[in-house]
């Protein structure tokens, strides 16, 4: 019996979400991240296209570029030159990897209203960017870097040893980009642009993932990246440094190496400026639990960089990998010597410390049984960051400023009572010297963007509180949502469930388990969101739950290492607890539940399913991986060592979905992955169903061709229709 | 290309009000503002005041109560007016262009015209 | 108001030479300064505006530098068509406020 949905005359002017809604993002909300360009302005693009420049002080709209311009190169982005001379207008995007695409840029020169004719850009361009001051442009093409004094100049090239798939120079490679830097770009201009630092990343030797795009020719092409799974043979990185304002003088300097880091493989994880002649490198051995930081000055009388041992910071973990996701990176005071940066205090707490000379002399800035997620700006009085602590919910965002210039430093929280209801899990942008900042409320309520005063955090206006969406959603039936914690073998395993428009505890549910459950992820946050699994509680009265158990983010080290070298045990585990618990609920009907997830969330619901504890009836798994053999080496060997007999090959063998088949026999399983996933490659499916018709197990299948990781466009359509029509039929639901 | 151009009369009487006209040319009005600035002979420049964008003025505290700028966006006109004149008001005026693409610089200039107040 | 200082209030210089005007803010305008050449009879112009960045057109002998409250502009090789007088201004807040002028002579 499903329970009946309507109950008094009001609710019956009111609908139910359809999947129509859902996949026309009939009900999706918009935020708006200033484009600060300096302390009082910022950039927007109006809804007529129009580039905008907005002064706060004086109230002022200016028109800087107008859509006719935009629209005469067919422009879909822009950046103004920080002389703001010129404009930089971005076109025939082309998508590459998850961050990296190429585009053809134009200069619009706005002091005359013309386009810069004469040494054009080439096309198509990896990466382009103003300097911080002035308008020299960088910009890589074909991977080699070259660079520009002034817009119509002809270039100079920095680097010409960039091959593709071979050497990458300003850009990352494929893991690089991925798994690490998590950008398109591998340069960084000083902050005045005196000099230019930039990666080379090896690739030479690397094993090259091949996979065929069908595309719509007779013969398919072939896609071969370099990429390294676990074990593998991985990029060589360098880093180098030259001069933009006499770049022939004694051209690309190389910066050295921390001698501790250099003795084996090791990474590189992220570059910070500190002044024109100060950088800060972050590097990392290949096992991810020594980090060191590198302060480097540079020396005139040489032309060269020195990064004296003195100036290492050395930071590791010895319950398991350092940092959280990444390592942290630092930030810098005024001083332009010591900096703050979140680590994790003695109680396994990722909090602020102020790091003046040691790591080990460190003052802690902020501590407690919750962890500081974001340093946003530190000012000469104050220091701007996020975290969790507020009325201790670990899936909020709370916006906090401490005053450094006075002692003992006062702490404030900005957003805790701002809009109490509606908003809980905060984001920030800040102008220069925050002067003014932007808050982004993501939810629980509808998301709104408001502007502060940056001395007093006056909201000054609202620059989104998206009115449509609100209007719209008046007559919907939207699903409940409450976040909840249990208490299992202190372990804490805070949920979220999603529940029909008119729930009643007395009657029996289809429950559906939406994980994900990587390492250093969350699930369980404070936002809004009209998706699929919102659609599912709203029309097929399905109660949904998201779990966060061990292995995930922001509750301390004990949860997030907990999955240390043994991937896919806890996790699953604490999904199934989890369902235990709400089975005891008793508003679940047992019989009729299942477990969905995409990426490393189709791998925990792959073992799930196969976990042989019979509560799931059928479950889905999305471009899961299936071994972490065949995933990337810095991801995986971040969270599970090295697949060799002496480190931890046992658990890379016992921790397959493959070595599970047999356990598929008694659920309803569909197995669902884009030939052309880069990420997650589409060998991980098909070695699970090799290994389902190998053990003579019946399952169901849908690979989408020539999609990616994200199947996307058309194929969001197909999938999630296929999705529900297999929930609605596992849970006996009519269409 | 961009042109400002003040016009008025180049003689005013003393404690009567002075009134110019700057026409613009060769830019978009939504871009910048107009700024009134004036150099009495063989001195430095004073700035008298401005009209943004979006029509908002904002005056010099020292002539604040005498003055007014006003636009007309249509005929693409900016008009300064500043009453009860003296003497001190003597001085070549200038229209000029600012905007948030110098700063607020003052990047184009009007070649100015003379007042000179006397009876 | 910020009152701009500038000096000398005027130099005789070479061609050749390299030449350094100063300008003092009554209080920290950031960078908004700019700096303007006046010849006789004629409207201003802009050379600098930022503190640093040259204004279009603009030979690079002209040049820019400071912050807060203290300024510099330099002409790095005099030219006969240089003579001129020199104006630093704030463009920080209003009332938008001048320096008292520098008029630079050839020897």
């Known amino acids: 019996l499903r329970p009946s949905r309507v109950h008094n005359s009001e609710e019956n002017t009111m609908r139910a979400l359809t999947l129509k809604d859902i996949l026309n993002g009939t009900f999706s909300y918009k935020t708006f991240f200033p484009n600060w360009i300096s302390g009082q302005e910022y950039l927007h693009q109006s809804a007529d296209n129009n580039i905008v420049l907005y002064n706060i002080e004086t109230g002022q709209s200016y028109t800087i570029l107008s859509n006719r311009t935009m629209k005469s190169v067919n422009a879909s982005n822009y950046g103004l030159s920080p002389d703001r001379q010129f404009v930089y207008l971005e076109s025939d995007y082309s998508k590459l990897w998850r961050y990296s695409y190429t585009a053809t840029y134009y200069i619009y020169d706005l002091s005359n209203g013309e386009f810069v004719r004469g040494n054009e850009l080439p096309r198509p361009i990896q990466y382009l960017c103003w300097s911080p001051v002035g308008s020299k442009l960088a910009y890589v093409y074909q991977n080699n870097i070259y660079l520009k004094q002034r817009p119509g100049d002809p270039p100079f090239q920095i680097t010409f040893n960039g091959r593709e798939n071979k050497i990458f120079n300003g850009i990352p490679d494929w893991v690089y980009e991925e798994e690490m830097l998590a950008t398109k770009y591998a340069l960084w201009w000083s902050p005045n642009g005196k000099f230019l630092a930039y990666a080379e990343f090896n690739d030479t030797d690397i094993p090259v993932i091949a996979y065929s795009y069908y595309g719509d020719e007779q013969y398919p092409r072939t896609i071969n990246i370099p990429y390294p799974k676990a074990g593998a043979k991985n990029p060589v990185v360098r880093i180098f440094i030259i001069d933009t304002t006499y770049p022939a003088y004694v051209g690309p300097q190389e910066v050295p190496v921390p001698a501790m880091i250099a003795s084996s493989d090791y990474y590189f994880s992220w570059l910070t400026w500190v002044t024109d002649e100060r950088v800060c490198l972050q590097w990392l051995k290949r096992v991810q639990n020594v980090s060191v930081l590198s302060i480097c000055d540079f020396r005139e009388d040489w032309q060269t960089w020195d990064c004296p041992k003195t100036q290492e910071h050395i930071e590791e973990s010895r319950t398991g990998w350092a940092g959280g996701f990444f390592v942290s990176t630092p930030v810098f005071s005024y001083d332009a010597i010591s900096y703050y940066k979140i680590f994790s205090d003695k109680d396994g707490y990722k909090h602020i410390h102020y790091i003046k000379d040691t790591v080990e002399n460190a003052i802690q800035i902020t501590s407690g049984k919750w962890e500081a997620i974001n340093i946003f700006r530190v000012t000469q009085d104050s220091l701007f960051y996020s975290s969790n602590e507020f009325e201790e919910y670990p899936g909020r965002r709370n916006i906090y400023r401490i005053s450094i210039g006075s002692y003992p430093p006062s702490k404030k929280c900005v957003t805790c009572h701002l809009r109490k209801e509606r908003c809980q899990y905060y984001t920030a942008s800040f102008s220069d010297y925050a002067k003014y900042y932007a808050l982004v409320c993501y939810g629980p309520g509808i998301p709104i963007s408001t502007l502060h005063d940056g001395r007093t955090d006056q909201e000054i206006k609202i620059l989104e509180e998206n009115k449509e969406l609100e209007n719209a959603l008046k007559n919907i039936q939207l699903p409940k949502e409450e976040i909840k914690k249990l208490e299992v073998d202190e372990i804490t395993l805070w949920y979220k469930m999603i529940l029909p428009p008119q729930f009643d505890r007395s009657k029996k549910y289809p429950l559906l388990i939406q994980v994900y459950g990587g390492p250093c992820s969350q699930s369980v946050r404070s936002v809004f969101a009209v998706n699929w699994i919102s659609y599912l509680a709203s029309k097929e009265g399905m109660v949904i739950a998201l779990v966060d158990g061990r292995g995930t983010a922001f509750q301390g080290d004990k949860l997030l290492y907990a999955v240390y070298r043994k991937l896919g045990v806890y996790e699953v585990e604490d999904q199934i607890t989890a369902v235990r618990k709400f089975i005891e609920m008793g508003f679940i009907d047992e019989k009729r539940i299942a477990i969905w997830g995409w990426s490393y969330g189709g791998y925990v619901s792959s073992l799930a399913l196969a976990s042989g504890t019979g509560l799931f009836k059928c479950g889905i798994a999305v471009a899961p991986v299936s071994s972490w053999e065949y995933y990337a080496s810095v991801y995986t060997e971040r969270f599970m060592g090295l697949p060799t007999k002496d480190d931890n090959l046992e658990h890379y063998k016992n921790s397959t979905v493959m070595a599970r088949a047999e356990y598929f026999r008694n659920v309803d399983y569909l197995l669902i992955h884009g030939t052309a996933d880069d990420n997650v490659h589409f060998q991980n499916s098909a070695q699970i169903a090799k290994a389902l018709v190998n053990a003579q197990v019946d399952f169901q299948a849908m690979w989408y061709s020539d999609q990616n990781h994200g199947l996307s466009g058309l194929s969001t359509n197909h999938l999630y229709t296929h999705m529900t029509h297999f929930l609605k039929q596992c849970f006996s639901l009519s269409d | 290309q961009v042109q400002l151009q003040e016009s008025g009369p180049g003689l005013v009487k003393p404690s009567e009000t002075l009134s110019l006209t700057c026409t613009v040319s060769?830019?978009?009005?939504?871009?910048?503002?107009i700024n009134w600035i004036r150099q009495p002979p063989g001195k430095g420049l004073e700035w008298i005041g401005l009209?943004?964008?979006?029509?908002?003025?904002n005056y010099n505290p020292s002539l604040k109560s005498r003055v007014t700028i006003s636009k007309d966006t249509s005929k693409s006109q900016f008009s300064l007016k500043l009453s009860s004149v003296t003497a001190a008001d003597t001085a070549v005026y200038y229209c000029?262009?600012?905007?948030?693409?110098?700063?607020?610089?003052?990047?184009?200039w009007g070649q100015g015209t003379l007042v000179t107040v006397s009876s | 108001d910020i009152q701009m200082t500038q000096s000398p209030s005027s130099l005789s210089a070479s061609v050749g030479d390299r030449v350094t005007i100063t300008c003092k803010a009554s209080?920290?305008?950031?960078?908004?300064v700019a700096w303007y050449q006046q010849k006789p009879g004629k409207a201003p112009k802009l050379l600098i505006y930022?503190?640093?960045y040259r204004y279009t057109g603009v030979p690079s002998r002209f040049s820019g530098s400071g912050s807060g409250t203290d300024f510099t502009f330099t002409i790095s090789s005099l030219q006969p068509e240089d003579i001129a007088t020199y104006y630093c201004?704030?463009?920080?807040?209003?009332?938008?406020?001048f320096g008292g002028g520098t008029k630079v002579e050839i020897k």
């Open positions: 000029v262009r600012g905007g948030p693409l110098v700063w607020y610089a003052l990047d184009y």
């Open positions: 060769g830019f978009s009005l939504t871009n910048y503002d």
């Open positions: 009209i943004w964008t979006g029509g908002g003025t």
């Open positions: 209080q920290d305008v950031s960078t908004a």
């Open positions: 930022s503190a640093s």
């Open positions: 201004q704030q463009h920080y807040s209003n009332p938008r406020t």
